[in-house]
Amino acid sequence: SEVEYRAEVGQNAYLPCFYTPAAPGNLVPVCWGKGACPVFECGNVVLRTDERDVNYWTSRYWLNGDFRKGDVSLTIENVTLADSGIYCCRIQIPGIMNDEKFNLKLVIKPAKVTPAPTRQRDFTAAFPRMLTTRGHGPAETQTLGSLPDINLTQISTLANELRDSRLANDLRDSGATIRIG
């Protein structure tokens, strides 16, 4: 069964995949695809490398590690719920039926929006946005603003007052949830 990896909406997701090049610069073609690994290559290819470089990629998908040293881990930028599913990393080692293939399951959770410690009626404080940092591991999350005991009524009022704001739309569209306590 697939190894499972998790990320939140708005974060960068990280799917690890590695191999050891036979010699420095002696690279092996690798493909990443959305969906389990098929019989050959990758289905729905999102990124591909050849013996020298990344030769195909699509928006939001990139290799953050040093692929010339065999780190072909995939980063998916600013994930949405639609990015959930199985991904295939296929390392096309030369020879007769030598491919290494890995199915990785990505689970995307709605962003946790944590209410916070001061009474300012500021939407970004009551509904902190998640910031992501690019790095090798899963994206780190940071929250802006803060405030203590905010109750459901206050949240409801804030949301009503600012329901036309872009952030409110973002929260609705991404299925973000508000956690109390």
Partner: antibody
């Protein structure tokens, strides 16, 4: 025009050898995996062999492993199948087929290989 | 090897009929199921890939569905040029394998 054209089929005795060719045109040949698929007279389709775009990864059905060798020359846009130690059960029409997004989306017209004494 | 079983093996139908051919895999194939049409003396032609996707140029009367192990090819309204043999093929497990074929004949 996008097409594949096989050649090299014919009559050969059991134990003999034959080399099939498949000339591609109209697309970026080196970007695709290719396969050979065969069809015995009056029978269904059987996958035989496949090769990666750079030619360095190859794949074979158990029925032909050790006897057949798939290769390609990307500078000539040509795919090959070297068939050795041929048997009567290898008699079939051999098709080359381009593999794209998990399907064989482009096929040649086929070349008939007959193994008989 | 993954065994692909098609049914029926042969089928008689008339122009304008709706026809369904089924294909069952011996194990789950993650939707990696293709359908091909072959006419006598000709090479196969890809009709459906990835269970339900239509290649450019294939008429919309052809459709595919299914997941896991059970898949279906439907021709919504048979045309004279549709009488042929149809094969399913799985592209998940090694080696790729084909069904035994379904011969669609004129009634």
């Amino acid at each position: 025009e996008v097409q594949l054209l096989e050649s090299g089929g014919g009559l050969v005795q059991p134990g003999g050898s034959l080399r099939l060719s498949c000339a591609a045109s109209g697309f970026s040949f080196s970007s695709f995996y290719f396969s050979w698929v065969r069809q015995a007279p009056g029978k269904g389709l059987e996958w035989v062999s496949a090769i990666s775009g750079n030619g360095r990864s190859t794949y074979y059905a158990d029925s032909v492993k050790g006897r057949f060798t798939i290769s390609r020359d990307n500078s000539k846009n040509t795919l090959y199948l070297q068939m050795n130690s041929l048997r009567a059960e290898d008699t079939a029409v051999y098709y080359c087929a381009r593999y794209y997004n998990t399907g064989f989306d482009l096929w040649g017209q086929g070349t008939l290989v007959t193994v008989s004494s | 090897d993954i065994v692909m079983t098609q049914s029926p093996s042969s089928l008689s139908a008339s122009v304008g009929d709706r026809v369904t051919i089924t294909c069952q895999a011996s194990e789950a194939i993650y939707g990696y199921l293709n359908w091909y049409q072959q006419k006598p003396g000709k090479a196969p032609k890809l009709l459906i890939y990835a269970a339900s996707s239509l290649p450019i140029g294939v008429p919309s009367r052809f459709s595919g569905s299914g997941s896991g192990t059970d898949f279906t090819l439907t021709i919504s309204s048979l045309q004279p040029e549709d009488f042929a043999t149809y094969y399913c093929q799985q592209a998940y497990g090694f080696p790729p394998t084909f069904g035994q074929g379904t011969k669609l004949e004129i009634k």
